[in-house]
């Protein structure tokens, strides 16, 4: 492990931007730790406000966590020559609130990107595709980790946060090769309808600790490779027949449904029947009712149709205030 002091080289934010002579291939930026043997550079908890310019060309794993980057402009990692080996980039907890289109361009080997724990008030639709073309060059990304990227309420823009994230995931169909997507802890109220259709290679999808109330308009049909679907700690009340059938039709999937406020009324009957026969749900014996009050803490697998009733809907003339 080594660390180095200042140098004179520079790298562009954009292809046309200012630059100087290319970096020495093995030098380590100031405030960073480098291991050529491990192909790793760590610039961690150093209050960096920009991505270091003099990154060694051998870097395969780059940790830029715990900094104060604020904004990632287009070409933030573009270098001459390019960082052709960079495969894993961790930017978590670096106070990013703006990721622009093309921020990760010119990283031909980038397989894993972690932007977790950054309050992303602005995520460009072209952050991952790098282009505003309707079909752009495929991104090399295989794992995209976007846990807890929701900004505080006072920094949220007019458009929905869910929509902003969805636009970045589907733009240019660039993420067709994505295997892992983590979107936990983002206060999602819904999952935009077309997102999963554009991510056909997903094997692992984490939507835990959001505020999802329903999956009625979400289609899992395309996700034939899906192995793990994490829906723990949401606000799900019931899964309807269409969703149950789609999940059952996925050949490899394991679904995690713990800690949702299941409503055990007549609408739950199909889900209970399905739970009793499916092998898809992990820990299904832990699922319990939250509502109505009389059913609280009852185990879903132990319910029968007689337990699952709905209060009759009174005609308006008989309703009281």
């Amino acid at each position: 492990t080594s660390s180095a002091s200042s140098s004179s080289s520079s790298a562009p934010f954009l292809a046309s931007a200012a630059s100087a002579q290319p970096p020495l291939p093995d030098q380590c930026p100031a405030l960073c730790e480098c291991s050529e043997a491990a192909r790793t550079v760590k610039c961690v908890n150093r209050n960096l406000t920009e991505v270091p310019t003099d990154l060694p060309l051998y870097v395969r794993n780059l940790f830029l966590t715990g900094n104060q980057l604020a904004v990632l402009p287009a070409g933030a990692f573009a270098r001459r020559p390019p960082l052709a080996e960079l495969a894993a980039l961790n930017l978590s907890g670096s106070r990013l609130d703006e990721v622009r289109g093309g921020a990760f361009e010119h990283l031909p080997s980038l397989r894993q990107l972690d932007l977790s724990h950054n309050p992303l008030a602005y995520l460009s639709p072209f952050a991952f595709s790098g282009s505003n073309a309707s079909i752009s060059a495929p991104s090399p990304l295989v794992e995209l980790i976007l846990n807890h990227i929701v900004p505080p309420d006072d920094k949220r823009q007019n458009r929905s946060f869910e929509g902003m994230v969805a636009a970045a995931l589907v733009a240019g169909r660039a993420l067709q090769g994505l295997h892992l997507l983590e979107l936990a802890s983002n206060h999602f109220l819904y999952l935009p309808r077309d997102v999963l259709a554009q991510l056909p290679s997903l094997r692992y999808l984490d939507l835990s600790n959001n505020s999802l109330v329903s999956l009625t308009y979400v289609s899992f049909r395309n996700l034939t490779h899906l192995e793990s679907l994490h829906l723990e700690d949401n606000a799900l009340k019931v899964l309807h027949n269409g969703t149950l059938a789609e999940l059952q039709g996925l050949p490899h999937v394991r679904v995690f449904l713990d800690n949702n406020p299941w409503v055990c009324d007549c609408h739950m009957a199909d889900m209970v029947t399905w739970l009793k026969q499916t092998g898809v749900v992990q820990g299904k014996d832990r699922l319990t009712c939250a509502f109505p009050e009389k059913m609280r803490n009852r185990v879903l697998l132990e319910l029968n149709s007689a337990d699952l009733d709905c209060d009759p809907i009174l005609p308006p003339s008989l309703q009281t205030s």
Partner: antibody
Framework: EVQLVESGGGLVQPGGSLRLSCAAS????????MHWVRQAPGKGLEWVSY????????YYADTVKGRFTISRDNAKNSLYLQMNSLRDEDTAVYYC?????????????WGQGTTVTVSS | DIVLTQTPLSLSVTPGQPASISCRAS??????????LHWYLQKPGQPPQLLIK???NLESGVPDRFSGSGSGTDFTLKISRVEAEDVGVYYC?????????FGQGTKLEIK
């Protein structure tokens, strides 16, 4: 009181070299990025170069890239600009200026400037 | 490179009267989270000084007769009542990307 004091300017022939210095006081120098900005006689302001607080990032205007080198010594509260292969068009007053970051920043403190004259 | 075009290039104002300077960028310098446009005043024989940061935020110690507005590509610096000490050249500057660039400057004189 925040103070930035430039030095090292002077008369130099085309192709020659100069090293400018900027001495900082009145603030924690190592917490701030620093810029060089220049102003040719009777002209407007032109950004020249930037160095981040910990010397991890360096940026240059196309007009000076490959000829100028920015550096700093946080232990000495000093910023430097090594200028090589000087040209007539490099004649200007050179200011050092402080910023909290490159893109999210602005020039919130300036020195009085040092004059560089390139002439044969 | 982003080009900033200031208008007018010069103006002559009677003390106590308002003044307005426009700065137009060749592309947007705003995002939904920040506006990358700042204003400076360079008084005769002095270095520039920061007046307004991020389009509309008054720098500490700057009189409140100065104000800034705008987003995207169009920005305005206003002086509600010009005083003799306001003479000099006003510059807008963006920090959207490298290279940082300045407007060509607007010279304010007192009538």
């Amino acid at each position: 009181e925040v103070q930035l004091v430039e030095s090292g300017g002077g008369l130099v022939q085309p192709g020659g070299s100069l090293r400018l210095s900027c001495a900082a006081s009145g603030f924690t120098f190592s917490n701030f990025g620093m810029h060089w900005v220049r102003q040719a006689p009777g002209k407007g302001l032109e950004w020249v170069s930037y160095i981040s607080s910990g010397s991890t990032s360096f940026y240059y205007a196309d007009t000076v890239k490959g000829r100028f080198t920015i550096s700093r010594d946080n232990a000495k509260n000093s910023l430097y600009l090594q200028m090589n292969s000087l040209r007539d068009e490099d004649t200007a007053v050179y200011y050092c200026a402080r910023t909290n970051s490159l893109l999210r920043g602005f020039f919130d403190a300036w020195g009085q400037g040092t004059t560089v004259t390139v002439s044969s | 490179d982003i080009v900033l075009t200031q208008t007018p290039l010069s103006l002559s104002v009677t003390p106590g009267q308002p003044a307005s300077i426009s700065c137009r960028a060749s592309q947007s310098v705003s995002s939904s989270s920040y506006t990358y446009l700042h204003w400076y005043l360079q008084k005769p024989g002095q270095p520039p000084q920061l007046l307004i940061k991020s389009a509309s935020n008054l720098e500490s110690g700057v009189p409140d007769r100065f104000s800034g507005s705008g987003s995207g590509t169009d920005f305005t610096l206003k002086i509600s009542r010009v005083e003799a000490e306001d003479v000099g050249v006003y510059y807008c500057q963006h920090s959207w990307e490298i290279p940082l660039t300045f407007g060509q400057g607007t010279k304010l004189e007192i009538k």
